[in-house]
Interface confidence: medium
């Protein structure tokens, strides 16, 4: 089977059940339902999934049975619309149920919430978790899928199955270990961090498809796959791009069964054709399906073919440039992007896309000019400033990171971004700036040749988080502008923002800066978040505060927390010393 099946199926639900197997079918339906109805209790979802699974089995037995010919959207949508508390729990989302497919599914998609009002996941004691795991392994793992899926409504479903497999393996191994906690906790931390990163990366793919269209996603995929598979022919890369686009379009559209099935087919195709794709796939292709697909997605770049000719010959010097462009614009631009990307694993994908856009704009202008060749002869010179801008930015920020360390680097970014877009909510500014700050430890350790693809493509993922969170409750025209004008220029757009001079400082509220003894029992990370929240609020109160003023206040704050956490009567200390700290801070900042 190729990724595009042309064989007709009487029953789509039976077809997917047979392709995926019962276990994966149930897991994917649970993920789909939890991503749509994010507030529903676990037990309600399990009941719905069991009903769908039983129905699927009747269709496997007899594809002509009643309703088996219905589309998956119709079947799943009908099932979701049976939820009794839909109106009370989800408000206007209940109106989706009055619509017909495909409008009903589009309506459900529009109501996915990137920041659902759900309690933070608290990790129970290791013994409690191990008991729950042993008592009912199936329910324990389903609960994991449910909790992740409802908090991350765009999580890449087939990849979530891979995470669940690792989650199960961690418990299977560690619940038998002598020191369960020492074995389990680092594994769970790793899964949590990787899961958040995976969710954010997929969110960017979905935003790319949904906000900027298939062409934008395909351009991204051509660039990335050409970097990864520089020995593959252009036609091969194009085929992979088409198939990958289909997979991600399906997952982003809530078609998780089709997506998982097509992703498996794509992995199969890649492994069957690895000789013409990449020499780095051998190990990946020996793994079981979920591991194989994950491995292929993360595989290192293959070596560039030796003696690749100069790009200028075909794309600048050739007399056929305008003719080839006119013949098939997107193919010619695709070839340009492919040829440029395979030669530049040292560039970020977004930079490659900026170069391709510049090239396209130049050809559009020049191929209608009196002397096209003279007009576009210097097009590669226009690339120089585009390449140097991220190089310089990364150099400066890595120097700052090495000087300050991660926490203080995050603080510098918090101040920078709060001054740029002070209207954005404090939790969003803290979350985004903390993640932006992680670029330092993630990428600055790399040699020059790997820094830009690591840093700028990571920043694209993080800034997309800002964009999707801001879209839910838009408060800043500047954020909206940077988020919507151009996908590939988001980072330069935010970088170019200066202090927002139109911002009216927030009224001072002592309550914002009142702390209690509970801060002492927080983890180091949570304590940092408290301090960073205070820092953002300070900047919102006094946007013109200097670095030195802010540093002095933050140092006093750190000393105050340390002092009161050592005090015998912590609560009294926080109350009395807190008042003094607020007064001193107001004086220091001239509030």
């Amino acid at each position: 089977r190729g990724v595009f099946r042309r064989d007709a199926h009487k029953s789509e639900v039976a077809h997917r059940f047979k392709d995926l197997g019962e276990e994966n079918f149930k897991a994917l339906v649970l993920i789909a339902f939890a991503q749509y109805l994010q507030q529903c209790p676990f037990e309600d979802h399990v009941k719905l999934v069991n009903e769908v699974t039983e129905f699927a089995k009747t269709c496997v037995a007899d594809e002509s049975a009643e309703n088996c010919d219905k589309s998956l959207h119709t079947l799943f949508g009908d099932k979701l619309c049976t939820v009794a508390t839909l109106r009370e729990t989800y408000g206007e989302m209940a109106d989706c149920c009055a619509k017909q497919e495909p409008e009903r599914n589009e309506c459900f998609l529009q109501h996915k919430d990137d920041n659902p009002n759900l309690p933070r996941l608290v990790r129970p004691e290791v013994d409690v978790m191990c008991t729950a795991f042993h008592d009912n392994e199936e329910t324990f793992l389903k609960k994991y899928l449910y909790e992740i899926a409802r908090r991350h409504p765009y999580f890449y479903a087939p990849e979530l199955l891979f995470f669940a497999k690792r989650y199960k393996a961690a418990f299977t191994e560690c619940c038998q270990a002598a020191d369960k906690a020492a074995c389990l906790l680092p594994k769970l931390d790793e899964l949590r961090d990787e899961g958040k990163a995976s969710s954010a990366k997929q969110r960017l793919k979905c935003a790319s498809l949904q906000k900027f269209g298939e062409r934008a996603f395909k351009a991204w995929a051509v660039a990335r796959l050409s970097q990864r598979f520089p020995k593959a022919e252009f036609a091969e890369v194009s085929k992979l791009v088409t198939d990958l686009t289909k997979v991600h379009t399906e997952c982003c559209h809530g078609d998780l069964l089709e997506c998982a099935d097509d992703r498996a087919d794509l992995a199969k195709y890649i492994c069957e054709n690895q000789d013409s794709i990449s020499s780095k796939l051998k190990e990946c292709c020996e793994k079981p399906l979920l591991e194989k697909s994950h491995c292929i997605a993360e595989v290192e770049n293959d070596e560039m073919p030796a003696d690749l000719p100069s790009l200028a010959a075909d794309f600048v010097e050739s007399k056929d440039v305008c003719k080839n462009y006119a013949e098939a614009k997107d193919v010619f631009l695709g070839m340009f992007l492919y040829e440029y990307a395979r030669r530049h694993p040292d560039y970020s994908v977004v930079l490659l896309l900026r170069l391709a856009k510049t090239y396209e704009t130049t050809l559009e202008k020049c191929c209608a000019a009196a002397d096209p060749h003279e007009c576009y002869a210097k097009v590669f010179d226009e690339f120089k400033p585009l390449v140097e801008e991220p190089q310089n930015l990364i150099k400066q920020n890595c120097e700052l990171f090495e000087q300050l360390g991660e926490y203080k680097f995050q603080n510098a970014l918090l101040v920078r971004y709060t001054k740029k877009v002070p209207q954005v909510s404090t939790p969003t500014l803290v979350e985004v700036s903390r993640n932006l700050g992680k670029v330092g430890s993630k990428c600055c350790k790399h040699p020059e040749a790997k820094r830009m693809p690591c840093a700028e493509d990571y920043l694209s993922v993080v800034l997309n988080q800002l964009c999707v969170l801001h879209e839910k409750t838009p408060v800043s025209d500047r954020v909206t502008k940077c988020c919507t004008e151009s996908l590939v220029n988001r980072r330069p757009c935010f970088s170019a923002l200066e202090v927002d001079e139109t911002y009216v400082p927030k009224e001072f509220n002592a309550e914002t800066f009142t702390f209690h003894a509970d801060i002492c029992t927080l983890s180091e990370k949570e304590r940092q978040i408290k301090k960073q929240t205070a820092l953002v609020e300070l900047v919102k109160h006094k946007p013109k505060a200097t670095k030195e003023q802010l540093k002095a206040v933050m140092d006093d704050f750190a000393a105050f927390v340390e002092k009161c956490c050592k005090a015998d009567d912590k609560e009294t200390c926080f109350a009395e010393e807190g008042k003094k700290l607020v007064a001193a801070s107001q004086a220091a900042l001239g509030l």
Epitope: K218, A235, S238, K239, V241, T242, K319, D320, C322, K323, N324, A326, E327, A328, K329, D330, V331, G334, C367, A368
Partner: antibody, heavy 119, light 111 residues
């Protein structure tokens, strides 16, 4: 306004030569490919070949290679389709089309030239 | 013999929807959505109604829509009207340095 105007209908005998024309106006003639399409009586459309008037690069469909010649004179914004020796099976309606962006997309068409070859 | 395959004829009643398929699209044409559809009335020049698989030129009714799955493209006409009765042909890019190809054409009859 973009227009493609083709020369009038022709009645010829087998073995004779013929050159029909397609004049473009209202756009930059040298920046777009021109395609020629044959439609035999009661049959479907067939792409015969394409030409880029900017440099006269010409490509033919395999079944028309050596059977016809496509040319262009950019100074008068005109493309041509010619036969050196007509056959009865060349009887058909011939259309020219401006190809926008990709060769499979003819966005403006001539009105057609009917060629009849009969002894 | 065309490289693209279409049904010779389809028919439908006014108000109904019909779909015409076009199989044999090359993978490169598929990757870049290089498929067009033309409408032709007897004795008239073809008219572009869909390009790049799904796009409609301005002035073309939104009753006409295009889609693609794998190596098959489809043209759907909804709310069929008497003046939709015509020949419909698909055309696809045949690869760099090659000439495009047409499908054999499909005669639509409105009953």
């Amino acid at each position: 306004e973009v227009q493609l105007v083709q020369s009038g209908a022709e009645v010829k005998k087998p073995g004779e030569s013929l050159k029909i024309s397609c004049k473009g106006s209202g756009y930059s003639f040298t920046s777009y490919w021109i395609g020629w399409v044959r439609q035999m009586p009661g049959k479907g459309l067939e792409w015969m070949g394409i030409i880029y008037p900017g440099d006269s690069d010409t490509r033919y469909s395999p079944s028309f290679e050596g059977q016809v010649t496509i040319s262009a004179d950019k100074s008068i914004s005109t493309a041509y389709l010619q036969w050196s020796s007509l056959k009865a099976s060349d009887t058909a309606m011939y259309y020219c089309a401006r190809l926008h962006g990709v060769v499979s997309r003819g966005d403006y068409w001539g009105q057609g030239t009917l060629v009849t070859v009969s002894s | 013999q065309s490289a693209l395959t279409q049904p010779a004829s389809v028919s439908g009643s006014p108000g109904q929807s019909i779909t015409i398929s076009c199989s044999g699209i090359s993978s490169l044409a598929g990757s870049y959505n290089l498929v067009s559809w033309y409408q032709q009335y007897p004795g008239k020049a073809p008219k572009l109604i869909i390009y790049e698989v799904t796009k409609r030129p301005s002035g073309v009714s939104n009753r006409f829509s295009g889609s693609k799955s794998g190596n098959t493209a489809s043209l759907t006409i909804s709310g069929l009207q008497a003046d939709d009765e015509a020949e419909y042909s698909c055309s696809s890019y045949a690869g760099r340095n090659a000439v495009a190809v047409f499908g054999g054409g499909t005669q639509l009859t409105v009953l």
